[in-house]
């Protein structure tokens, strides 16, 4: 049976918590990704940003989970208007910001 949206969001949050807590060396070797506006369409925007990071096993599960939230196909190099123009941040900071935002969505009951 399909996983309820609240459960899926909680699992994504728990995966991001895992990443932040288990981080020893710089996450994804300090790779930089485009910063995004944490507004509507956050899942696709986050995936569009993180999909450009390759060879980083620490975020592969997150990429797969975000794929389940995003209704359209996302491929590397693609970017929506949610990108913060010309601003790149480290993956570790991106994950931390995304985590805070998703926990707030969970607390507010916004699962889709």
């Amino acid at each position: 049976s399909p996983v309820p949206p609240s459960t899926a969001l909680k699992e994504l949050i728990e995966e991001l918590v895992n990443i932040t807590q288990n981080q020893k060396a710089p996450l994804c070797n300090g790779s930089m990704v485009w910063s995004i506006n944490l507004t509507a369409g956050v899942y696709c925007a986050a995936l569009e940003s993180l999909i450009n990071v390759s060879g980083c096993s620490a975020i592969e599960k997150t990429q797969r989970m975000l794929n389940g939230f995003c209704p359209h196909k996302v491929s590397a190099g693609q970017f929506s208007s949610l990108r913060v123009r010309d601003t790149k941040i480290e993956v570790a900071q991106f994950v931390k910001d995304l985590l805070v935002h998703l926990k707030k969505l969970f607390r507010e009951g916004q699962f889709n």
Partner: antibody, heavy 120, light 112 residues
Framework: EVQLQQSGAELVKPGASVKLSCTGS????????IHWVKQRPEQGLEWIGR????????KYDPKFQGKATITADTSSNTAYLQLNSLTSEDTAVYYC?????????????WGQGTTLTVSS | DVLMTQTPLSLPVSLGDQASISCRSS???????????LEWYLQKPGQSPKLLIY???NRFSGVPDRFSGSGSGTDFTLKISRVEAEDLGVYYC?????????FGGGTKLEIK
């Protein structure tokens, strides 16, 4: 150490406005919610509303809509409560509190309170 | 709005006694994310409120195990197994599931 430091006591005339502040230290207010709570003399606690300083998403109890305005300035790590058209009913202690940072399940830290007295 | 009704208004006890405070909500306070955000706070004279119990039955760090919370749906209880002098003050239940969040009217625990 996490702390919420509120501005000092205010004595204000009826009809005037006042802006109370709540400054966080030891944490970033963008990472949580800041709530405001009212307590009239010898009375219980009333939730006024809360702000998500990361995006200025604000929720009020409808009974405080029009009376209270909650804002935040992330550069100074401070939340504000503005109260307008003051009457004796607004005489109270006003507390700010933050939601804990894991899942925002509860208020783990409170300010010391600001006493507002409305009197001519 | 969710009305939180606390009983009794005043609770005179002898030190060492058990105390029980009831809190009823006017509707279910199960959040859409599955959690029940029911908290108990203690306010001593001249002080800010302090958290005792969250999500119905979880004791906050540093809270003595003589405090326990229980209940579900619309009916909740705070119990103090052996009242100590430092427990005196006003106890408030609070629901953080539905906006506007609401407090109960308070229960004053005092010496008989």
């Amino acid at each position: 150490e996490v702390q919420l430091q509120q501005s000092g006591a205010e004595l204000v005339k009826p009809g005037a406005s006042v802006k109370l502040s709540c400054t966080g230290s030891g944490f970033n207010i963008k990472d949580t919610y800041i709530h405001w709570v009212k307590q009239r003399p010898e009375q219980g606690l009333e939730w006024i509303g809360r702000i998500d300083p990361a995006n200025d998403n604000i929720k009020y109890d409808p009974k405080f809509q029009g009376k209270a305005t909650i804002t935040a300035d992330t550069s100074s790590n401070t939340a504000y409560l503005q109260l307008n058209s003051l009457t004796s009913e607004d005489t109270a202690v006003y507390y700010c509190a933050r939601s804990e940072e894991n899942w925002y399940d509860f208020f783990d830290y409170w300010g010391q309170g600001t006493t507002l007295t409305v009197s001519s | 709005d969710v009305l939180m009704t606390q009983t009794p208004l005043s609770l005179p006890v002898s030190l060492g006694d058990q105390a029980s405070i009831s809190c009823r909500s006017s509707q279910s306070i199960v959040h859409s994310n599955g959690n029940t955000y029911l908290e108990w706070y203690l306010q001593k004279p001249g002080q800010s409120p302090k958290l005792l119990i969250y999500k119905v039955s979880n004791r906050f760090s540093g809270v003595p195990d003589r405090f326990s919370g229980s209940g579900s749906g619309t009916d909740f209880t705070l119990k103090i197994s052996r009242v100590e002098a430092e427990d005196l003050g006003v106890y408030y239940c609070f629901q953080g599931s539905h906006i506007p969040y609401t407090f109960g009217g308070g229960t004053k625990l005092e010496i008989k």
